[in-house]
Structure formats: structure tokens, C-alpha cells
Interface confidence: low
Amino acid sequence: FNISGCSTKKLLWTYSTRSEEEFVLFCDLPEPQKSHFCHRNRLSPKQVPEHLPFMGSNDLSDVQWYQQPSNGDPLEDIRKSYPHIIQDKCTLHFLTPGVNNSGSYICRPKMIKSPYDVACCVKMILEVKPQTNASCEYSASHKQDLLLGSTGSISCPSLSCQSDAQSPAVTWYKNGKLLSVERSNRIVVDEVYDYHQGTYVCDYTQSDTVSSWTVRAVVQVRTIVGDTKLKPDILDPVEDTLEVELGKPLTISCKARFGFERVFNPVIKWYIKDSDLEWEVSVPEAKSIKSTLKDEIIERNIILEKVTQRDLRRKFVCFVQNSIGNTTQSVQLKEKRG
């Protein structure tokens, strides 16, 4: 199709080489077409499309994204050619940064229902650059945490080194929805609730003498509880003796509950005490068996191919540790009688 009639928007993605970050493009169709195509009256009288920075109503997935090759080849369907780019309704998600993402992206309705719809398209010229500004050493991360129940803030990474006074007007989106009230480079959250978690996008306009660009950054916000003040506790084994049959295989499980820590480095290991000797056992990897907002239960097993007489003289010790402290639980094997 002829893309010369598409409205054009220029975007700049400056990515940090020291962190993983994502990027998004919204299918931001121009207003006349948006009202004609994107807000077709397909809703029941009780429904009203909520405001989106792109298409509203039930047409959310009715768009097609293309990339325009720089060599003038025909448009390429994003879904077929670019595995690191995912289409979610009207949003294009770039999972990995890199200058190879630079280019022209076109979105338009899948269903062309009238001659007016032909021009219902938008061309986004995306320029991707690595961040070179060394003066801004402490720019905000693209992954930010908010502590539940307290006051918090979300900073726009591309503007976090500027004071609020210097900062240009910023447009914020949360999970694709416009946050109409927020206009500065930092959103202050009065009280953090679980629904503040999500993908935030901040946009501002940068102009030179020739043209203007929308500088965009994406922030993944996670709501968290405060770091635990407790050392981990061992849920299993509970007993300090275990009846076993000689010559049979045996698996002893150690399950421990670790409270939430922002920087989480849990330790769970088995070691054996035999008279004055003590050594760590190489056992299968630990695995998380339950994870909630407040804590995580991790399990690690020790496997004996067959229980020997010598094993009855040993103590099998599960050792767990977090940044607060450690806990141990030892198990003595006892031969089953009868």
C-alpha cells in the first residue's frame, strides 16, 4: 500500500549499555482517522471506550505493523521477520535494545472498510542510539521499585539528571493508558498500592533547528514489600531423626522460607558432619517452589543412592542464609527396626 499519506512521528530511543531495557511504539493514529476507524461504534450502549494513546474500543488488535527496509524493498510484516519484536494489541514491544532497531515502522488497520481508511496509517521513524552522556552517571533505572504502603516516585530515565525546573513537559503512560495529570519528569506516588505496578512510558519533545523528536523511555515498575528483618526459617525437615532402611535410596528435602529482600541472594545447602570432619555435598540445584510478594519458599534435596551403615553415624545438616543471618537443621539417620 502507498505510505505517502501516513502521518509521521519521529522517536528517539537512547538506551543504556549497562542495563536491560525495553521499548514500545503505540499505534498513534491521527485524530480524523481515529474517530472514523478506531472509534467505530461497536460497543453496547453501556460501554464507552476508555482513553488510550492509540486506538480505542474493540479494534485494539485490528492493526498491522510493518517495517520499511532502508533499501527500498517492500514493507515487511513485523511478526514474520522480527522475533525480538512483539505485537500486543496496538503496541509494538522491543524486547532488546540495539541500533539495529532503528528504522521506519508503519501501522495501519488490518481491515480497510472504506476509501478513508487507506490513509489511516502512521509511520514512526525510530532512531536508536547508545547512551553516551557520561556526565549523568546516576540516571534512573529502567527497572524501578515502589515500596507498598509508603510514598514513592517513578523517574523518567532520560530526564532524571535534570532538575524539575529544567525539565520539559513530559507525557506519561501506564500500561498504554495516558496519565493525563502527570506532566513532570518524576511521578510522586502518595501511597503505593499493588495497582501501581506496570509498564510506564515517558515522552518529551526535543527540537533542533530542523525537526523535532519524541524522546521516549520505558520503565518497568514493581511494587514490593519492605526487606525482611528476619533470617530464613526451615520448614522441612522438622524432626532431627529420620528412620531409614539400609541399602535403599533416600532423598531428604530441605525447604526454607526466605522473607523478601530487594537484593536477594539466598543460600540453601547441605553439608555432612562425620566425627570431626565436615563437608558440603554437591546436590541438585535449589528450586523455588512458592513465591509471593512477601516471601519465597526454596527447596533443595540431598540424594543418597543407597543408605549405608556409615551414613547412620553422620549428621546431615541443611544450612540456609540470607543477609540477616543463617539457620541450620540437622538430621540423624536411624535404622528402621522390624
Partner: antibody, heavy 122, light 111 residues
Framework: EVQLEESGGDLVQPGGSLRLSCAAS?????????ICWVRQAPGKGLEWVAC?????????YYASWAKGRFTISRDTSKNTLYLQMNSLRAEDTAVYFC?????????????WGQGTLVTVSS | DIQMTQSPSSLSASVGDRVTITCQAS??????LAWYQQKPGQAPKLLIY???KLASGVPSRFSGSGSGTDFTLTISSLQPEDFATYYC?????????????FGGGTKVVIK
């Protein structure tokens, strides 16, 4: 059919208490939107009272005049919203509407109940 | 909190008249404004959202305009069923909850 139905309105003496209920049908009180109370005194305009977030946090918001006297709550198992009103005054006499709102830019009250009348008089 | 001021508080008009109601916000609310119609003994009904978008099932004689602080509801040709009270409402939503404040209302009566 998606609807809200208020109940519990009554004649009550000044200083008394009353609990209003709002039963939802066709949707659940557990999602990314607000359920709110809006009131209207006889012959007067609409006035926002309080909202509760229908997500798991159940966070609550009140008009400044309602704080301390009114409490909004919900029972997700019964799909019901409540407004507990204490220390009632004559000026609280109004029709109380239960409404649903979506937390998105430019949202509006698209779903209203029929209202329940609260009369505060001696 | 934002204040919403509606004018006039009442107006009398005849069937076929063009009617204009205005609403002023105490601060910039961009296009985040809704208009409701309420008839006696009934719950309000949404007419316009986002300042100018017609809610589903609302006749095209109703239109909304404006942005920032000044907004207008226009009924191009008043019909008998349009005699009612009209309210504007700010519909801002931020990361923090913003109370959705109503204007005082405009009663449209038969001349």
C-alpha cells in the same frame, strides 16, 4: 446484564448511623476500576462521596467532608459495596448512587445504580 | 481539589432552539471532561466523554467542545425529551486518585 442496585436507604435521626449496600450483577467487584458513591441532596447537584479500588489492595478515597464519618468497604464474595455512615446530619439527606468508574485517562461514570434515599430528620 | 463552575444555573428555551451550556475548571484538565443528563427521578446518563466524544446511543444533536479550563455543551436543536438538568464533571486520573468533581448543574426548562 451489567447493573448496580442500591439498598439500605431509610429515615434516620440526626447523630444516628446507617449502612447502604450496592449489589453488582454482570461483573465482579474485583478488577482494575473504582466503585464509588455519589450523592444528590433534594433539588441539588451531584456530589462525589467516596471510592474504593476494586483490585486486591481495596484502597479507599473520600471527599474531605466524608473522612471520619463515612466508611466505604466491599465484600468481594457477595459482590457488594457498602457505605457505613455515622454521626449523620440533616445535610446528609440525599439520594445515594452507586457508580462504577475505570481508572484510565478520561474515564467517566458509565454505570449508575437507581439510587437509594437517605433522610436524616428528627 | 479542582472546582467546576457551570453556567447558567438554569435557562429556558423552546423546542428547536440551539442551547449552549458552559463549564469552567479551576485548573487545566486538558480534555478530561464529561457531560451528563439527568431527568427527574432518574440516575444521570453519560452524554459526552473526553470533552467532545459522544457516548454510545446519544443523539448527534449533542456535541461537546473545549479543552484546558473552558468547555461547552451544545444541543443543536432542542427536542422535548432534552428538558433536563445537565452536569459537567472533571474526569482526570493520575497515578494518585483524583476526585471526579461535578459542576453545579444547568436546568433546561421549557419557555
Amino acid at each position: 446484564e451489567v447493573q448496580l442496585e442500591e439498598s439500605g436507604g431509610d429515615l434516620v435521626q440526626p447523630g444516628g448511623s446507617l449502612r447502604l449496600s450496592c449489589a453488582a450483577s454482570g461483573f465482579s467487584f474485583n478488577g482494575n476500576y473504582y466503585i464509588c458513591w455519589v450523592r444528590q441532596a433534594p433539588g441539588k447537584g451531584l456530589e462525589w462521596v467516596a471510592c474504593i479500588y476494586a483490585g486486591s489492595s481495596g484502597s479507599t478515597y473520600y471527599a474531605s467532608w466524608a473522612k471520619g464519618r463515612f466508611t466505604i468497604s466491599r465484600d468481594t464474595s457477595k459482590n457488594t459495596l457498602y457505605l457505613q455512615m455515622n454521626s449523620l446530619r440533616a445535610e446528609d439527606t440525599a439520594v445515594y448512587f452507586c457508580v462504577r468508574d475505570k481508572p484510565a485517562g478520561g474515564s467517566s461514570y458509565t454505570l449508575w445504580g437507581q439510587g437509594t434515599l437517605v433522610t436524616v430528620s428528627s | 481539589d479542582i472546582q467546576m463552575t457551570q453556567s447558567p444555573s438554569s435557562l429556558s428555551a423552546s423546542v428547536g432552539d440551539r442551547v449552549t451550556i458552559t463549564c469552567q475548571a479551576s485548573e487545566d484538565i486538558e480534555s478530561y471532561l464529561a457531560w451528563y443528563q439527568q431527568k427527574p427521578g432518574q440516575a444521570p446518563k453519560l452524554l459526552i466523554y473526553q470533552a467532545s466524544k459522544l457516548a454510545s446511543g446519544v443523539p448527534s444533536r449533542f456535541s461537546g467542545s473545549g479543552s484546558g479550563t473552558d468547555f461547552t455543551l451544545t444541543i443543536s436543536s432542542l427536542q422535548p425529551e432534552d428538558f433536563a438538568t445537565y452536569y459537567c464533571q472533571s474526569t482526570l486520573y493520575g497515578v494518585n486518585f483524583v476526585p471526579n468533581v461535578f459542576g453545579g448543574g444547568t436546568k433546561v426548562v421549557i419557555k
